[in-house]
Amino acid sequence: LTCLGGFASPGPVPPSTALRELIEELVNITQNQKAPLCNGSMVWSINLTAGMYCAALESLINVSGCSAIEKTQRMLSGFCPHKVSAGQFSSLHVRDTKIEVAQFVKDLLLHLKKLFREGQFN
């Protein structure tokens, strides 16, 4: 993630800024969506609770060849403390429910906006 420290004292992005940037990216995706996002690919739905950043990444990482969500995947990896690879699943997945990537992004965006409003950045 980008470094927003002063020239003399570079440091990591504050969590609020990182969350803001992730929200901005998801907004860009929803705004710029012409054709079905990622050709209508389906991903596992997730529970939007603690640990949901890793769960979201685990779902989206299984979508390949979709440039529209590559930046989101990279940003989510900055929120997830462990390495995530395709085929990995956590208990946060609603394993019997698949939804389109576009709906997944929409649900995630709404939840992140509420977290931002509540000051929950980590």
């Epitope: 907004v27 929803t30 939007l48 709404l110 950045f121």
Partner: antibody, heavy 125, light 112 residues
Amino acid sequence: QVQLVQSGAEVKKPGSSVKVSCKASGFYIKDTYMHWVRQAPGQGLEWMGTIDPANGNTKYVPKFQGRVTITADESTSTAYMELSSLRSEDTAVYYCARSIYDDYHWDDYYAMDYWGQGTLVTVSS
Amino acid sequence: DIVMTQSPLSLPVTPGEPASISCRSSQNIVHINGNTYLEWYLQKPGQSPRLLIYKISDRFSGVPDRFSGSGSGTDFTLKISRVEADDVGIYYCFQGSHVPWTFGQGTKLEIK
């Protein structure tokens, strides 16, 4: 169009409870916070609490904690405010209001942009 | 709890003249996310309140540009550049930055 329609006026005895409903239309309540605000006769506005209908998380003003319960039913797009152990000082108009979150701005206004018409609750022996 | 103090409590204004309402918070109301959730609402006689201004200075859709908000930290102002007869009512400031969220006591604007 967006509407919040509240239940009708109530007359209650001291010590009893009241449950006011707020039926939403024209939007999904899971995309919002739903708030409750009250106004005693001739007095100002008092925020009581809020709910995130997507997960049921609530925030209450400490003075109402334990007496107020805010709930929401996504299936009927309705928010509820229940106030128990009523006393005469609870006589007021109770309003519901929403704060909406949309897909098209990174930072929504979050403020209470639509309000119900108000429900008068009279507490009298 | 954060106390929001408005002044004046009563504001008689001649139509066409400007009006200004002050709102002071008992402590800084910058939210942890960097925003300041300071809002202004107008309640006309017999009606529900309606949103005028959010985040200090952003006008809500449909609100005339005669209304403007300013301020920072603990001091905020609502200005009406030219008051019209339709502007009568009670104006409330509100902070939504720190729970419990709180309203000011209201300023009653009346036409002279």
